[in-house]
């Protein structure tokens, strides 16, 4: 019977006849960096070219003793994951090993450094087709492994990592915490976060999806027809490299901000046990689970959008956090959120050439975060209109006056401490689509853009009563751009998006003694593109 | 220690002044930073990762390199370039004492650098 | 201009202490590893022992390991070589020398007899 | 440890000749650590050449050094009276550093 974990990353709605993409990874070479491997083992003999690459630490203790099986068990299991014969993810992808992890599992930044110039050295050498870099293995934070990492995504390769299993914030590790790379958590069987003895994975914004990661079966080094079931973050990154391996072979021309969007838009929502993770953590963690796209689905027509957040910006009164979107991705539109309700919104903000969202907190607040929707979206052009506060009762409004541009998200802003003590707005009056409503004392921006066939709506959903969260959803075939609440008063603690979904939070009203006057609604933008729409039809 | 010989002139250079401000003096505002990994036991101090500003041409990093290893010398101290980068990012890797590391943040064209740490298999 | 001056040299019984001082002076002395480099009458020139800027890292030459002692006031801009144990074979004029041995202390003699 | 033979032990020429001083290592020495030092009678000693070859401040263009690996030389092209003295070459790549036991380079 199939292993569970290859059960579970296949989709839902496949058929059997047709459940492999084409060449199953054939056209893509995914680079393994981890320790020695045993190349002849049956499950990979033959797909694994062994590179002369090897930048590894001695060995800690005097007294270790180099044992080849124990050398090579790590990268032999991983190497069967992504593309063995058997148990592997991608059945067709060449793999190619470069150790720069010891007998112990131990390696360093400076060695994986030299091994990912290698790669990008044998790339401008000998160009093949699309790349795919697995790093199994995780370190303290480090600018420069992020920053190298970061360059050779930019130089057109797919790096996947493990999250770590540290059960803490993969922000904490790297290459884990770099933005371009996929970083990957583990869950297992019951679509729990992998526990690994008193750790388990990591967690967190750093973390754009999960994978199986717990009893995987996969080849074992201790002889060549052995198999082995491990567990551990590793495993999991070697299923999306594996999947990336398969959605690459189908589509070479991806980008990795596509190769990303796609692997977050198949993958099965909200599976995973939240619980498991820390309170704090647990609205940042993607409830992800990466799943193979079904093979007769060119997903080219879809608006594909994710939901970036930011780092926390700290206590101080003036503090910001700033969220960001891949190279290639367009940021539509910018929220913000905090824990204690004491903020001062957010705005959309140009910074070397590229929008960012900003979030800002107040006097007396924990500290804010900004999330920013970043999607896929060609031929875009995106602009800011704001209006300042108007003072006046009826709150500020902001719409898209420019011909063909439409309202994809709105943000506002305010220098008051406590918009709570101010009178709130009556709701967007119906039929103006194109604009953006606000406190009287905020300013309020509208995020508006053209792009061929690009139609949006809004779609409002207000619960009269006080509620401690308000969430509206996107119909299928429309994806969410933009998510802010309705009205901006102090008890709400912010907006942000999950998936196709809108959730709009409050404080709990039992305990800050508001009134049910004070009603919450939550304002969704969904877009679509035509074009893209048309473009797929003329496909298929 | 063994490593490659080193080319001199930068020493040559810095020898020619006995006052110490002149040979050390910086080249620019010394605005380049140090980070070491916030995990202590990870720490591997003694290697470091000599980053240079982006636009820096690819010659500079050998040529970097070699200044730093000069000035070193001149002050006694050993270092050993272990590796110079140009494919990813402009740069080297050195093998020195931690003491040379003001000496190595004053160095033009210098960004950050950052003491080596380790990586686990996960 | 750089200088080097040695003092606290001596006649000293064997089995006795000494400690010898290199006050430098027209050079940022925290920036430079420093040597004590000893030479017996009529002899070749000995490394003895060094010590870096911050005076966290210290070599001896295994003739002294144990007995001789390398260290640094960085305030004073002062080396020290305390030596204990002191044999008949450690007689000789001791130099302090700076960094790549660019500069040299004019020396100090060292005589241990009974 | 690293082993500096020097040869010859004395070299005996006259003002206006050629010297040419030999360093042996008993392993290879980085040569950018490898310096040569004059001395004379009654004085500390005066770096001459450090890095193998290069020049220290003040050393005049006649004193040249060269040589990789595990071979070195000093050569002096045209002996000036105040060249006579004796000569050191020194490692300082390993420790523990190590100086040759000298050529004593004498008026003939």
């Known amino acids: 019977s199939i292993p569970w974990n290859l059960e579970r990353i296949t989709p839902a709605r496949y058929r059997a006849d047709e459940y492999q993409p084409p060449k199953g990874g054939s056209l893509v070479e995914v680079y393994l960096l981890d320790t020695s491997i045993q190349s002849d083992h049956r499950e990979i003999e033959g797909r694994v070219m062994v590179t002369d690459f090897e930048s590894v630490p001695e060995e800690d203790g005097t007294r270790f003793h180099r044992q080849a099986s124990k050398c090579d068990s790590h990268g032999t299991h991983l190497a069967g994951v992504v593309s063995g014969r058997d148990a592997g993810v991608a059945k067709g992808a060449g793999l190619r090993s470069l150790r720069v992890l010891n007998c112990q599992g131990k390696g360093t930044v400076s060695g994986t450094l030299i091994g990912l110039e290698f790669i990008r050295k044998s790339q401008l050498v000998q160009p093949v087709g699309p790349l795919v870099v697995l790093l199994p293995l995780a370190g303290g934070y480090s600018r420069v492994f992020n920053a190298a990492c970061q360059r050779l995504a930019r130089a057109g390769v797919v790096l996947v990592t493990a999250a770590g299993n540290f059960r803490d914030d993969a922000c904490l590790y790297s290459p884990a915490s770099a933005p371009e790379v996929i970083t990957v958590g583990a869950t297992n069987a019951q679509d729990q976060p992998v526990t690994l003895g008193t750790l388990g994975t990591n967690f967190g914004r750093c973390v754009d999806l999960f994978a199986p990661g717990e009893d995987i079966i996969g080849a074992s080094s201790d002889c060549s027809t052995c198999f082995v079931s491990r567990s551990g973050t590793s495993q999991a990154a070697a299923h999306v490299a594996g999947i990336a391996a398969m959605m690459l072979s189908a589509e070479p021309e991806l980008t990795l901000a596509e190769l990303r969007q796609r692997l977050i838009h198949f993958s099965a929502k909200d599976v995973i046990n939240e619980a498991w993770f820390p309170e704090d953590q647990r609205v940042l963690t993607p409830n992800l689970v990466a799943a193979l796209p079904p093979s007769t689905h060119r997903a080219g027509w879809q608006l594909f959008c994710r939901t970036v957040w930011s780092a926390h910006s700290g206590p101080t009164r003036m503090a910001t956090a700033v969220a960001r979107c891949a190279q290639d991705e367009e940021l539509l539109s910018c929220s913000s959120f905090s824990r204690s309700g004491k903020r001062r919104g957010e705005r959309i903000e140009a910074q070397g050439g590229k929008r960012v969202c900003r979030a800002h907190n107040a006097f007396g607040g924990e500290g804010v975060y900004a999330i920013a929707r970043c999607c896929l979206l060609p031929q875009v052009n995106c602009s800011v209109h704001t209006a300042p506060p108007a003072g006046a009762s009826m709150g500020t409004r902001v719409h898209c006056h420019q011909q063909g541009h439409v309202l994809t998200g709105c943000s506002s802003h305010w220098e008051v401490e406590d918009l709570g003590t101010h009178k709130p707005p009556v709701l967007r009056p119906r039929g103006q689509p194109n604009q953006c409503v606000g406190h009287r004392e905020a300013s309020i921006h509208a995020s508006c853009c053209h792009a061929p066939g690009l139609e949006c709506k809004v779609k409002e959903h207000g619960i009269p009563a006080p509620q401690e969260q308000v969430i509206v959803a996107c119909e299928d075939g429309w994806t969410l751009t933009g998510c802010s609440p309705l009205p901006g008063t102090s008890h709400v603690l912010g907006a942000y998006a999950v998936d196709n979904t809108c959730v709009v939070r409050s404080r709990d009203v039992s305990t800050t003694g508001s009134t049910s006057k004070e009603a919450v609604a939550a304002v969704a933008i969904c877009c679509r593109s035509r074009h893209l729409v048309q473009a797929s039809q003329e496909l298929q | 220690q063994e490593d490659e010989d080193g080319d001199y002139e930068e020493l040559v250079l810095a020898l020619r002044s006995e006052e110490d401000g002149l040979a050390d003096a910086p080249e620019h505002g010394a605005t380049a930073t140090f980070h070491r990994c916030a995990k202590d036991p990870w720490r591997l101090p003694g290697t470091y990762v000599v980053v240079l500003k982006e636009e820096t041409h690819r010659s500079q990093s050998e040529r970097t390199a070699r200044r730093l290893q000069a000035q070193a010398a001149r002050r006694g101290y050993l270092t050993k370039i272990l590796h110079v980068f140009h494919h990813l990012l402009p740069g080297f890797l050195v093998k020195m004492s931690g003491d040379l590391l003001e000496l190595a943040l004053k160095l033009p064209h210098v960004d950050y650098i950052e003491e080596d740490s380790s990586v686990f298999a996960q | 201009q750089v200088q080097l001056v040695e003092s606290g040299g001596g006649l000293v019984q064997p089995g006795g202490s000494l400690r010898l001082s290199c006050a430098a002076s027209g050079f940022t002395f925290s920036d430079y590893y420093m040597h004590w480099v000893r030479q017996a009458p009529g002899k070749g020139l000995e490394w003895v022992s060094n010590?870096?800027?911050?005076?966290?890292?210290?070599y001896y030459a295994d003739s002294v390991k144990g007995r001789f002692t390398i260290s640094r006031d960085n305030s004073k801009n002062t080396l020290y070589l305390q030596m204990n144990s002191l044999r008949a074979e450690d007689t000789a004029v001791y130099y302090c020398?700076?960094?790549?041995?660019?500069?040299w202390g004019q020396g100090t003699l060292v005589t241990v007899s009974s | 440890d690293i082993v500096l033979t020097q040869s010859p032990a004395t070299l005996s020429l006259s003002p206006g000749e050629r010297a040419t001083l030999s360093c042996r290592a008993s392993q290879s020495v980085n040569s950018n650590y490898l310096a040569w030092y004059q001395q004379k009678p009654g004085q500390a000693p005066r770096l001459l050449i450090y890095g193998a070859s290069s020049r220290a401040t003040g050393v005049p263009a006649r004193f040249s050094g060269s040589g990789s690996g595990t071979d070195f030389t000093l050569t002096i092209s045209s002996l000036e009276p105040e060249d006579f003295a004796v000569y050191y070459c020194?490692?300082?790549?390993?420790?523990?550093?190590?100086f040759g036991q000298g050529t004593k380079v004498e008026i003939k």
């Open positions: 010590i870096s800027g911050s005076g966290s890292t210290t």
């Open positions: 020194q490692q300082w790549g390993d420790v523990p550093i190590t």
């Open positions: 020398a700076r960094g790549m041995f660019d500069f």
